[in-house]
């Protein structure tokens, strides 16, 4: 329950309030704001706007409206140079180039510094070659190429379909498989959905339409020539050869009328199976190379685009708490763009813009939140979570000894199904709880709780009666908050339906129609999709702020420890022989698990009943629960991944967007049958088996009576 | 309203040159592929050149290859027509015509096409 008792204040200044203020109207009005003009990360524009919204913040009523500044590696194409892709004869002459940009929208064709689509750190190069399809790039889709189809990629251009995993990851693949470039295109099968018009008709993405994105592996570090330590004036920088997770191989991204002409023409072996077709009229043929007429005929990348050393800023706002000003709960989302930006991220930052509207109203009527509130506009997220990271390694000791939560706010929707919600366990009963509380925007839903509609439209697969809760992966800034520094964190949004929308993300992004009209006219003209990603965003960060007992329930931790347990076990027990030949036991983890749940209801029960009015007593309870996610870190980070330190939940190894629990001892057992070295292998499972269930042992005794 | 207003047209000797421009309005040319088209004295429609709306890719018939080329400025919303060593067989009306496809990469079909301007190749 929230209350206010400790702040002094009014019983009318509560969660009613604050919630009360949000406007649909003023997040409408923010949106157009913010997506008129492109907003690249270290671009003047972007700094601009930075400065609009510290100077707004302040009005708002802040306490304090910082900027903080790095100087990160960032890429950008040659605006004399352009990147493209040819057909070339085999006289070296090019009968066919890729678009240099795309179609401006209607009444953008007069704007002008919008980059053309570039895949973001690509190194340069012009490698010809054969052209292979890799369907989307990821790990099976190898698999299947090389071991089944004995299909070798070496020294071969591959074109993969975006989707399914993060682009990154396919890059990352198709390097070990031996490429020499990688193009990525947008099949209609995943980016156009059945029965919808195209852009400027409609939410699907026409044929000249491209999505934009950095292709790093950077494994959270941040700034890739500063790895765990933020990029200031007095840094010291790797040389470009020694930075974190830079591709070696030129990539670029083009549209799907280009694709068509690419892949007409393919030769060679046919598509494995259904699952490896898309949807243009092309025989999805892997090749290598094209069939008999043009069999002389190659494809040559040309790629142009530097690496730079930029300043980014972040707006940092705090709105300092009146009884635990020491005590932080952090919202935070991106500001920059790869365009105009119009649904990632200014549809998540004018629901930022409006929360901290409320907030500020609510302070300057005398009420001030039991907690202090950071509010954080991130810059360069897009080039791989630049801003916020840096900012948490600059922060970092504050962070681990204050950091109560982070709620993140990107893109607000990516359809108008339903609500989504990634979290950590410790925040499922404050989103069920709050979305009780707060009425359905849906359709048919009208008098129904956001609970009620939610649950029914994304039940959990597990409990019925509950709405589907997914595990924190990353390709966002709560990255570093969670996977590095063990800081409770979560974040929602207004989801598609995924049962009948199979596409990918949502077809316009990255791409230049991703404009303001694009969210007006068809995802949400009467911005009550976005009201209400801002009630629960907010909601969340308002009870996380000024609960006196703070909202988490560890006993939920508990449930999903078993449910991760049982589930790497199983896994593991596809190989029974070897388990049993190399001694390989989970007792450990399920007595540690099992630990976890007897200590976690205890405390629980200890929760309920403690007295309140004591200050030193209330504080220990609070900082046994904020410190709890902090437990799950092993300092020593996951196998070559320093900074996912986490040990319950990382990025999967395979799709950066995914989240794999247990991690440590999932990577261990994937493929292991492949392994030249079993004994090693299995060594390296029992190793995994051991520091989780340390790991798990070790958070749970955090739990305990503390004498 | 959308429209396509060519000009440059006239009497030329064989072998000089020409240059036909096409001011597009009502639209924006940096979205469309353009095309150029004639039609000679008592003959059908004969298909010229093509570009695509960024100027990434040219087409062009056989018979004009080599002597003709293509061009656009977007941000005077104009195509152009460049004609080297004209020939008798050259005489035609030639329009400019807008590719139907938003973004296309190769021609297609035109939707919207001008009033033509006269090009007469003669000694």
């Known amino acids: 329950k929230s209350s206010n008792e400790a702040t002094n204040i009014t019983p009318k200044h509560n969660m009613k309030a604050f919630l009360d203020e949000l406007k649909a109207e003023n997040i409408k009005k923010f949106l157009y704001n913010f997506t008129q003009i492109p907003h690249l990360a270290g671009t003047e524009q972007n700094f601009q706007l930075a400065k609009q919204i510290q100077s707004q913040w302040k009005e708002f009523g802040l306490d304090s409206v910082e900027l903080a500044h790095y100087d990160v590696l960032l890429s950008y194409p040659n605006k004399t140079h352009p990147n493209y892709i040819s057909i070339i004869n085999e006289d070296g002459n090019e009968i066919f180039n890729t678009s240099l940009f795309e179609p401006p929208p209607p009444g953008y064709e007069n704007v002008s510094d919008i980059v053309p689509p570039f895949s973001a750190f690509s190194p340069q190069g012009m490698p010809e070659g054969d052209l292979v399809y890799v369907n989307y790039a990821r790990t099976e889709d190898f698999f299947k190429l090389e071991r089944d189809m004995k299909i070798n990629c070496s020294g071969k251009i591959v074109i993969a379909r975006y989707g399914k995993v993060f682009r990154g990851n396919k890059v990352k693949n198709a390097q070990l498989a031996g490429a020499k470039g990688v193009i990525l295109y947008s099949d209609p099968a995943d980016y156009f959905a059945p029965g919808v018009k195209s852009y400027p008709d409609g939410w699907n993405l026409p044929g000249g339409g491209v999505q934009r994105g950095n292709i790093l592996n950077l494994n959270g570090a941040g700034d890739p020539l500063t790895p765990g330590y933020p990029a200031n004036e007095y840094a010291y920088r790797r040389g470009i050869a020694e930075a974190v997770g830079l591709p070696s191989i030129p990539v670029h991204p083009i549209g799907y009328y280009d694709a068509q002409k690419l892949l007409e023409k393919m030769g060679g072996s046919a598509p494995p199976d259904s699952s490896w077709r898309g949807s243009l009229k092309v025989p999805y043929n892997v090749g290598p190379g094209f069939t008999g007429n043009f069999s002389t005929q190659k494809v040559k990348m040309h790629i142009h685009s530097t690496n730079e050393v930029t300043r980014i800023y972040n707006v940092i706002g705090t709105l300092r708490g009146a009884v635990e000003p020491d005590r932080y709960v952090i919202l935070g989302g991106h500001r920059d763009s790869w365009v105009f930006g119009g649904i990632d991220p200014q549809s998540g930052a004018a629901v930022v813009h409006e929360i901290v509207r409320s907030f500020g109203t609510l302070k300057k009527e005398g009420w001030r939140p039991r907690r202090t509130i950071l509010f954080a506009s991130w810059d360069a997220e897009e080039f791989g979570l630049l801003g916020s990271t840096e900012w948490a390694e600059e922060n970092s000791r504050l962070l681990q000894e204050r950091g109560v939560a982070y709620i993140n706010a990107d893109s607000s929707i990516e359809g108008n199904y339903t609500l989504r919600v990634d979290c950590t366990p410790l925040m499922y009963s404050l989103v069920h709880n709050l979305t009780k509380e707060l009425k359905s925007p849906d359709e048919g839903f009208e008098g129904k709780s956001l609970y009620e509609s939610w649950t029914k439209k994304s039940p959990s697969p597990e409990f019925s009666g509950m709405p589907r809760i997914s595990k924190l992966g990353s390709g966002n800034d709560f990255e570093v908050f969670f996977q590095r520094l063990g800081i409770a964190s979560g974040r929602a949004r207004y989801t598609k339906n995924w049962e009948t929308n199979k596409f990918s993300g949502y077809p316009l992004y990255h791409s230049v129609y991703e404009t303001y009209e694009l969210v007006e006219k068809f995802y949400d003209p009467m911005f009550k999709y976005h009201l209400t990603v801002a009630q629960v965003r907010g909601g969340m960060v308002f009870e996380l702020a000024n609960s006196i007992v703070l909202p988490f329930d560890c006993r939920d931790y508990a449930v999903v420890l078993r449910k991760y347990a049982d589930k790497i076990y199983s896994i593991s027990m596809k190989h029974p022989q070897e388990m049993k030949t190399y001694s390989v036991s989970f007792d450990s983890l399920f007595s540690a698990v099992k630990n976890f749940t007897e200590i976690a209801s205890k405390f629980s029960e200890r929760l309920q009943d403690f007295d309140k009015s004591n200050p030193i007593v209330l504080r220990m309870m609070n900082d046994q629960l904020m410190f709890l996610e902090r437990a799950f870190i092993d300092p020593l980070g996951l196998p070559d991944r320093p900074f996912y330190r986490h040990v319950i939940y990382a990025p999967s190894s395979h799709n950066k967007y995914a989240g794999e629990s247990f991690p440590g001892i999932y990577d261990a057992l994937f493929d292991i049958e492949s392994k030249v070295d079993p004994s090693k292998a299995w060594g390296e499972v029992k190793r995994q088996i051991y520091v989780a269930a340390f790991t798990v042992q070790a958070a749970a005794e955090t739990l305990s009576e503390v004498a | 309203q959308v429209q396509l207003v060519e000009s440059g047209g006239g009497v030329v000797q064989p072998g000089r040159s020409l240059r036909l421009s096409c001011a597009a309005s009502?639209?924006?040319?940096?979205?469309?592929?353009m095309h150029w088209v004639r039609q000679a004295p008592g003959k059908g429609l004969e298909w010229v050149a093509f570009?695509?709306?960024?100027?990434?890719?040219?087409y062009y018939a056989d018979a004009v290859k080599g002597r003709f080329t293509i061009s656009r400025d977007n941000s005077k919303n104009t195509l152009y027509l460049q004609m080297n060593s004209l020939r008798a067989e050259d005489t035609a009306v030639y329009y400019c015509?807008?590719?139907?496809?938003?973004?296309?990469?190769?021609?297609?079909?035109?939707?919207?096409w001008g009033q033509g301007t006269m090009v007469t190749v003669s000694s």
């Open positions: 570009q695509t709306y960024d100027a990434s890719n040219r």
């Open positions: 009502g639209f924006p040319l940096i979205s469309y592929g």
């Open positions: 015509a807008r590719d139907r496809i938003v973004g296309g990469r190769v021609p297609d079909a035109f939707d919207i």
